[in-house]
Amino acid sequence: MMTGTIETTGNISAEKGGSIILQCHLSSTTAQVTQVNWEQQDQLLAICNADLGWHISPSFKDRVAPGPGLGLTLQSLTVNDTGEYFCIYHTYPDGTYTGRIFLEVLESSVAEHGARFQIP
């Protein structure tokens, strides 16, 4: 039975040209995390595998940095980076947990971080 929950940074905004940390946290389970995928709607950004370490998609190598922790840092943001991002936690024995973050990249300097929220 899957008892865990994923807490994410929720809806966030950042300035064009800046950077942002995408962060998820799995709680309320003793399941072992064996891999975390970071995905966009149509492509993989990065994988952190317990045995293999980090893999960053070549499309993002220049502006994606692994971490902190199991999170992902996006740099040199453009308006095209606006959209959904997903963290997928592969765990044993529970299975797969998914968290969603919506990032809005703003032209102006009024970017503010949204509230944190939980995805069961």
């Epitope: 891999q35 995905e39 149509d42 492509q43 993989l44 293999l52 893999h55 997928i88 998914t98 969603r100």
Partner: antibody, heavy 119, light 107 residues
């Protein structure tokens, strides 16, 4: 339980356009994070992904078929559709609808509908 | 597009034997490979995702391994109901692409 069911005309003539329907039960096609895809399987078993409509309504096509493909949906009926134009005999295949997860894998499939393009 | 190559169209085996099917990607796909089973007259069924993770309800005689470009799907002890065609799929990027399939049959 999630179920998908395809329907279509079966036989169409070359150069015509076909319209296939996928009816989904057990989940709304507007449920967050899922993509609703079309995949075809040629005689000889080769599988080809055609495209999807996302829960939000955005659509992505396989570039190799994009010029001939239209995917739409009817959310009140919980159906999505594939329209494929300028048909040739090479489009003869079984056409499947499937649910696609965030990981881009297909966890639920319909039983498929056979399309034969012949004069 | 990423090309997925299953070099064997057929694999002959005895019931109870171990059988391994290989799949090669044309570029590094990390661990983003899935495996499907298709029995005659049925639609494909998801067995493995992310190279080695069993989908819900899949028996533990089915395992997957590999990373980068080389992947293996193994049935540890083939049962009669496992006779089917098995496909790999990369779920790394768009367009999603499949291998040509490997049919597991009895000797």
């Amino acid at each position: 339980d999630v179920q998908l069911q395809e329907s279509g005309p079966g036989l169409v003539k070359p150069s015509q356009t076909v319209f296939l329907t996928c009816t989904v039960t057990g989940i709304s096609i507007t449920t967050g994070n899922y993509k609703w895809s079309w995949i075809r399987q040629f005689p000889g078993n080769k599988l080809e992904w055609i495209g999807y409509i996302y829960y939000s309504g955005t659509i992505t096509y396989n570039p190799s078929l994009a010029s001939r493909t239209t995917i739409t949906r009817d959310t009140p009926k919980n159906q999505f559709f594939l329209e494929l134009s300028s048909l040739t005999a090479e489009d003869t295949a079984s056409y499947y609808c499937a649910r696609e997860t965030v990981l881009r894998v297909f966890d639920y499939w319909g039983q498929g509908t056979t399309l034969t393009v012949s004069s | 597009d990423i090309v997925m190559t299953q070099s064997h169209k057929f694999m002959s085996t005895l019931l109870g034997d171990r059988v391994s099917i290989t799949c090669k990607a044309s570029q590094d796909v990390s661990t983003a490979v899935a495996w499907y089973q298709q029995k005659p007259g049925q639609s494909p069924k998801l067995l493995i995702y992310s190279a080695s993770y069993r989908y819900t309800g899949v028996p533990d005689r089915f395992t997957g391994s590999g990373s980068g470009t080389d992947f293996t799907f193994t049935i540890s002890s083939v049962q009669a109901e496992d006779l089917a065609v098995y496909y790999c799929q990369q779920h790394y990027s768009s367009p999603r692409t499949f291998g040509g399939g490997t049919k597991v049959e009895i000797k």
